[in-house]
Amino acid sequence: MRRGPRSLRGRDAPAPTACVPAECFDLLVRHCVACGLLRTPRPKPAGASSPAPRTALQPQE
């Protein structure tokens, strides 16, 4: 019996939680926070490798 497609998301990386519009989702700590606590991602220099910066996922109104 054929199984459905497997999730690309690891077991330790749950789907981003929906935040109320007053807040933003922090990918680093994986929960909703005041948007001012997030750091806007800065462009990386070519070839540089660093941990992913905090970013916000904002629900659409």
Epitope: V20, A22, H31, A34, C35, G36, A56, Q58
Partner: antibody, heavy 118, light 113 residues
Framework: EVKLVESGGGLVQPGGSLRLSCAIS????????MSWVRQPPGKALEWLGF??????????EYNPSVKGRFTISRDNSQSIFYLQMNTLRAEDSATYYC?????????WGQGTTVTVSA | DIVMSQSPSSLAVSVGEKVTMSCKSS????????????LAWYQQKPGQSPKLLIY???TRESGVPDRFTGSGSGTDFTLTISSVKAEDLAVYYC?????????FGGGTKLEIK
């Protein structure tokens, strides 16, 4: 229609405790953040904190001015959310409002008055 | 904490006049990733609880008359009432929700001459 009704206010002695309630109707209680805000007589508003929704594990944020003395909780089965206030001081005398948080503090209750006095 | 300063603290106007009131924050409320300013305006009529008028600095809450307009960005914000009505007698508060703790301004009391 969203309706928030606070209760539990009254006169309490300094050092005492009080638990305020906010009864919620008109929306699914588990799907919204709920906040508490207070207003001393004739003064401006002060945000006390909020409790997030079910999807966010009912986590809380507090104003440092009350953190450790005040606790926000909720009883989703009864659509009520609470503000437990301990070690009350005269400066805690105010009208206390509950509010639904979405875009900002979207809907407010009518408030309940707390007086801390000997 | 972010300090919110409102001016004037009170003003008296005649019905039909245009009113502007100011709100300044001690740090920017603009989140550059989505270009939203995390600032709200509330109206509190005598003996009543506050009511949300404007969120994200300029978006009018559903049911709020279009004579109320929010503007500004960063640290300087304005609430304008294009033609005051007697029912607009109230205290108007701005509030930031850019970071914790959320903070309110001291309010602007609007009186009708």
């Amino acid at each position: 229609e969203v309706k928030l009704v606070e209760s539990g206010g009254g006169l309490v002695q300094p050092g005492g405790s009080l638990r305020l309630s906010c009864a919620i109707s008109g929306f699914t209680v588990t799907a919204y953040y709920m906040s508490w805000v207070r207003q001393p007589p004739g003064k401006a508003l002060e945000w006390l904190g909020f409790i997030r929704d079910k999807a966010n594990g009912y986590t809380t944020e507090y104003n440092p001015s009350v953190k450790g003395r005040f606790t926000i909780s909720r009883d989703n089965s009864q659509s009520i959310f609470y503000l437990q206030m301990n070690t009350l001081r005269a400066e805690d005398s105010a009208t206390y409002y509950c509010a639904q948080v979405r875009r900002a503090l979207d809907y407010w209750g009518q408030g309940t008055t707390v007086t801390v006095s000997a | 904490d972010i300090v919110m300063s409102q001016s004037p603290s009170s003003l008296a106007v005649s019905v039909g006049e245009k009113v502007t009131m100011s709100c300044k924050s001690s740090q920017s409320l603009l989140y550059s990733s989505n270009q939203n300013n995390y600032l709200a305006w509330y109206q509190q009529k005598p003996g009543q609880s506050p009511k949300l008028l404007i969120y994200w600095a300029s978006t009018r809450e559903s049911g709020v008359p279009d004579r109320f307009t929010g503007s500004g960005s960063g640290t300087d914000f304005t609430l304008t009432i294009s033609s005051v009505k007697a029912e607009d007698l109230a205290v108007y508060y701005c509030q930031q929700y850019y970071t914790y703790p959320y903070t309110f301004g001291g309010g602007t009391k609007l009186e009708i001459k």
